[in-house]
Every structure is written in structure tokens, then in C-alpha cells.
Interface confidence: low
């Protein structure tokens, strides 16, 4: 029954998000006759590919085909057979592949080439695999959440978004946290964006938007942790690293070669008198927070205002949707409620990080320890990034909404990417597309 043509006239699209830590496949569906209406596209399936991100396959590209099989077969089941040939498939790779490309363009191209050949074997309309820019990642995330929130529609919305309802057409800013990069995107009040690299102009549904965006490469939660470890091991007196970002009693061996494998730790690299070191958790939020702040260079700013590392950031404006790892981590820590103040979040993090590792393991027995061990760091990092990095305050904290899904669709860049590439967001009534997309790799 799954492969019989549906009576209604619908279309499908597939986007694969090839992130630094894993790949997810999203299937979207919409009524064919309403392509240019806002809010009609919705997600019908998410399939998380088993295994790491595609950049990890650089030495074993022959395994990429098998890696993608399960989720592509799932797409074959979900989408009616009669629709297969006209269903576009896009793969966008993000910061994990940006980092690999920095190390070797040739290796990154080889991975993408095998990905393309693997995806071409399926009966869909494969449209290419490419590494999207950080600017695109930010922009498409912003488009996704505002499309789903009905912010581009001038007419009455056919759905109500109770938790985020603001009864106006002011767009939401987008805060996206991945494993290897983080993006901040919003419409500033004063429309001067002092740095051209951070400025985007869109005309969507007859309205102009001047949007600020920046993607901080190496400041996703995983790469930020590598950076912090590389920074801290420089001053360790031996191969024991007493780390406040891990629970008391936690121990883990890290290979120095793994630590220096990523371009993100190059600035901290030094010759160490050991090949491995052991992290020993001491669980102190305040010390962890201080250590993380050392990753943000705030001493230099060539603009009126900066985030960190000399990157322009206008004054924050309006409400923000914080998604991807911002949401996953805060959800795990039970801190996504609109009622939880920033002070309360900090208090909860202090208590959480101070809990002994054995106690944490017992409390969260179903969670794989490799992930469980990182929540103290990740939660502290999120607070540090939002407060000191992006200059949210205790007062403006209430304007951050931690969002997993909106009306059943995941918040993230993939929906915005597909809407753009399928020309489904008209400038007026369907004229030009909001973002140009460069030729496929």
C-alpha cells in the first residue's frame, strides 16, 4: 500500500544534512497546487543515518554507499513509487566538511564524489551534493523557522504556534549550534550591518529583509571541546588534566594525535612529552565557564560592537529560536521551559556539573556514557556562548526560545535550503529566488 499513488496531488523533496557528527535525511511534502503559499511544506520523516559524519569516511570512502543505504531505502518506502523520479534529493554538508576541505580540498572532493555517485543510484531526481557555506547555513535556518512560524505570510495563519505566538510579523532570529560550527542570524533594528560579509538582503513574499548572519567555524560544541582541551593541556604539569567541565570521578583517556587532528586546535598545538593524557573530572561550573571564556577573544574589535574574535555583531533585536544542539542539550538538562530564567539555568548547571559521575551514570542509566559525560561541558558552553559570546543578558534571556520542532518540522537549515532550491519562496509572486546557489560540487 505504501507505494500506491496518493489521490491528492502532492510533491515530495529530500534533503540530507551531512553534519560533522552525523547525517540526517529529511523528507518534506506539500500540496502541488500551493507551492508558493507560505507554511504549506511540512516534514513527514526524519531518518538518522547510523554512524559518524561523512568527513570521517575520508580513509574509507568505499563504505559511504552502505552507510547511506538504510535511510535512502526508508525514503523509497515513504515516498510513493509514482513520485520517485520527480522527487528532488539534495545533500548539504556543513562545518565538518568545511574543516576537511581546509585540510585537503582533494580529500573533501573525493568524499563528495563518492556521496554523489552513491545517491545517484537511487530512483530519485538527485540534484547534487555540496558543502554549503556558513552564511547559507545561517540564512536557511532563519528562513526555516520564520517560514514555519508563518512570519512571511501577510494573511491570517491557518495554524497557531502557541508557545511562540507574538501576534506580529516581526521575524525571529535564528541560533543554530552544531558539532563544528554555530550560527547567529537575525534582522537588526538599525539596519546598518558594518561588515559586508555578514549582510544578506532578501525579498520574500513582497517584503525586504536586511539580515545579519555569521557562522563561527570551530565553535560548534564538539570542536569547542577539542579547543578547550588543547588549550588546557598546554599548561598541565603532566598527563593528567583536571577538568572542571566533567563530573567529579569521571576519567577518560584522550590521544594527543586525536586532539591535534582537527584544524580547530592548531592555534594551541605544541609538542607534549606524552602521547595520551587522562581527563579527570572535578565538576566545577564556575571554573569550566572561565576556561571556556578563554576561547573567545574579546580584546580586539574593529567595529562598533563585536561578538568575539573581531566579528561584527549588531545589538540583539527581538525573539530568537535556538535549535539543533542548543535545543538537544537544554532539553536533556530540562532547561527549555520559557519560565526558566537565566539565573535559574546557571544555578541548575552548577548543581548538575557538581554531581559525582557515578551518581550521574545511575540517574541516566539509559544514556550512552560518551554523550552523558559531555552535558556539563555542553550546557556550560551554551551559557558562555549566549551570554558572553552573543551578549544576551539575564533580561534578554527570556527572548530565547529553545525549539526542537515547529508544527512537526525540525528547526534547522534543511527546509529553507529545499524551499530555496525548489523556488518555493517567491520574491513577489513567483519571481526571483532569495539566495543564489553556487554550482554543485
Amino acid at each position: 500500500t505504501q507505494n500506491k499513488a496518493l489521490p491528492e496531488n502532492v510533491k515530495y523533496g529530500i534533503v540530507l544534512d551531512a553534519g560533522s557528527s552525523h547525517t540526517s535525511l529529511y523528507i518534506y511534502k506539500w500540496p502541488a497546487e500551493k507551492e508558493n503559499d507560505t507554511g504549506v511544506v511540512h516534514q513527514v520523516e526524519e531518518c538518522r543515518v547510523k554512524g559518524p559524519g561523512i568527513s570521517k569516511f575520508v580513509q574509507k570512502v568505499n563504505e559511504i554507499g552502505i552507510y547511506l543505504t538504510d535511510c535512502m531505502e526508508r525514503a523509497r518506502e515513504v515516498i510513493p513509487r509514482s513520485q520517485h523520479q520527480e522527487t528532488p534529493v539534495y545533500l548539504g554538508a556543513t562545518a565538518g566538511m568545511r574543516l576537511l576541505r581546509m585540510e585537503s580540498e582533494e580529500l573533501a572532493d573525493r568524499v563528495l564524489d563518492v556521496v554523489e555517485r552513491s545517491l545517484s543510484n537511487y530512483p530519485f531526481d538527485f540534484q547534487g551534493a555540496r558543502i554549503i557555506t556558513g552564511q547559507e547555513e545561517g540564512a536557511y535556518g532563519w528562513i526555516t523557522i520564520n517560514y514555519l512560524l508563518g512570519k512571511f505570510s501577510q494573511k491570517t495563519r491557518w495554524f497557531s504556534i502557541v508557545p511562540y505566538e507574538t501576534n506580529n510579523q516581526e521575524t525571529f532570529g535564528a541560533l543554530d549550534l552544531g558539532g563544528a560550527s554555530t550560527q547567529v542570524t537575525f534582522v537588526p533594528q538599525n539596519q546598518t550591518i558594518e561588515s559586508p560579509d555578514n549582510a544578506l538582503q532578501f525579498r520574500l513574499y513582497g517584503k525586504d529583509y536586511n539580515v545579519y548572519t555569521h557562522s563561527f567555524l570551530c565553535y560548534g560544541k564538539d570542536q569547542a571541546l577539542w579547543q578547550k582541551l588543547a588549550k588546557d593541556i598546554q599548561v598541565a604539569s603532566n598527563e593528567i588534566l583536571r577538568d572542571p567541565c566533567f563530573h567529579p570521578g569521571y576519567k577518560k583517556v584522550v590521544n594527543v594525535s586525536d586532539l591535534y587532528k582537527t584544524p580547530c586546535t592548531k592555534r594551541f598545538e605544541m609538542t607534549l612529552p606524552f602521547q595520551q593524557f587522562e581527563i579527570q573530572g572535578i565538576g566545577n561550573y564556575q571554573q569550566c565557564h572561565q576556561s571556556i571564556l578563554e576561547l573567545f577573544n574579546t580584546s580586539y574589535c574593529p567595529y562598533s560592537q563585536c561578538a568575539f574574535n573581531g566579528i561584527f555583531l549588531p545589538p540583539l533585536q527581538g525573539d530568537f529560536g535556538a535549535f539543533s544542539a542548543f535545543y538537544f542539550v537544554m532539553k536533556f538538562l530540562n532547561l527549555t521551559s520559557e519560565k526558566v530564567s537565566q539565573e535559574k539555568v546557571t544555578e541548575m548547571m552548577k548543581k548538575f556539573c557538581a554531581q559525582p559521575w557515578e551518581e550521574i551514570k545511575t540517574s541516566y542509566a539509559g544514556v550512552k556514557e560518551k554523550y552523558l559525560s559531555e552535558y556539563c561541558f555542553s550546557g556550560t558552553y551554551i551559557l558562555s556562548l549566549l551570554l558572553q559570546g552573543y551578549h544576551f543578558t539575564a533580561d534578554s534571556w527570556e527572548h530565547i526560545h529553545f525549539i526542537g520542532k515547529i508544527q512537526g518540522s525540525d528547526a534547522g537549515w534543511t527546509l529553507g535550503y529545499m524551499l530555496n532550491l525548489t523556488n518555493m519562496i517567491p520574491a513577489e509572486q513567483p519571481l526571483s529566488t532569495p539566495l543564489s546557489h553556487s554550482t554543485y560540487v
Partner: nanobody, 135 residues
Framework: EVQVVESGGGLVQPGGSLRLSCAAS????????IAWFRQAPGKGREGVSC????????NYADSVKGRFTASRDTAKNTVYLQMNSLKPEDTAVYYC????????????????????????????WGQGTQVTVSS
């Protein structure tokens, strides 16, 4: 040096039993999920079983369910694979692999049974131990 070493393989008759051991040096096995893979002559590597770092969660390929049992001995820094009711099709080189990556959230909590796709996500491998089931 960080390494894992398998032992306990050998020649056994159909219906017989073997216990494989996976010992670690240079790191503590407690903190990591450990998987057993096998590779038969001319075939790809397949996941047979895995055990979570706590030891509280185990996972088995359909072909070995009810016959193989994974366990760990924290004091000895060793993980075991007890193999009962062995069949000729169990003949393979058996590898133990540790999921040692320090990068967090590499994947959701996952099954550890699968093919090469899964093998690619484990970082440290032993040299393997040969198991031959034949009369």
C-alpha cells in the same frame, strides 16, 4: 600505548562453546562501549554483539541471539564474548573494537550490529582471533 587484544579463539566442533576475551591496555575499558565484530573469509566485517560502557545494555545480531553473551569484568579491564551452540557459519576472525572517540555525540545511542558502516564508527581495533567451527 592504547591497544585492545583478543584471545580465546580456536578450533571447536559444531555445538561446542568458546569464550573470547578482549583485554585493554593504556586505557580503562569501563568508560567505553565495546563491540565484537567478525569477518568470514571473502566477506565484509559484521557486527555480532556490543556491550555498553556500564555493562547494562547489550545488543546482538539476529544470527547469534540466544547463543552469544557479552559481559565485562571491570576489575580485570576485560570484555568477554561467551559463544555457545557454535555453528560452522560462525567461522571467522573475531575482532574487539572500542568506541574511544573523544568527540561527543558522534551518534545517538545506537545498535552495534551492522556491517562496514558500523565498523567505521569504532576507533581502536585488536588484531583479531580466529574461530573455526568444524567437525
Amino acid at each position: 600505548e592504547v591497544q585492545v587484544v583478543e584471545s580465546g579463539g580456536g578450533l571447536v566442533q559444531p555445538g561446542g562453546s568458546l569464550r573470547l576475551s578482549c583485554a585493554a591496555s593504556g586505557f580503562t575499558l569501563d568508560y567505553y562501549a565495546i563491540a565484537w565484530f567478525r569477518q568470514a573469509p571473502g566477506k565484509g566485517r559484521e557486527g555480532v554483539s556490543c556491550i555498553s560502557s556500564s555493562g547494562g545494555s547489550t545488543n546482538y545480531a539476529d544470527s547469534v541471539k540466544g547463543r552469544f553473551t557479552a559481559s565485562r569484568d571491570t576489575a580485570k579491564n576485560t570484555v568477554y564474548l561467551q559463544m555457545n551452540s557454535l555453528k560452522p557459519e560462525d567461522t571467522a576472525v573475531y575482532y574487539c573494537a572500542a568506541d574511544l572517540s573523544a568527540a561527543p555525540y558522534n551518534d545517538a545511542v545506537r545498535s552495534c550490529t551492522g556491517g562496514n558502516r558500523l565498523a567505521a564508527t569504532y576507533d581502536f581495533w585488536g588484531q583479531g582471533t580466529q574461530v573455526t567451527v568444524s567437525s
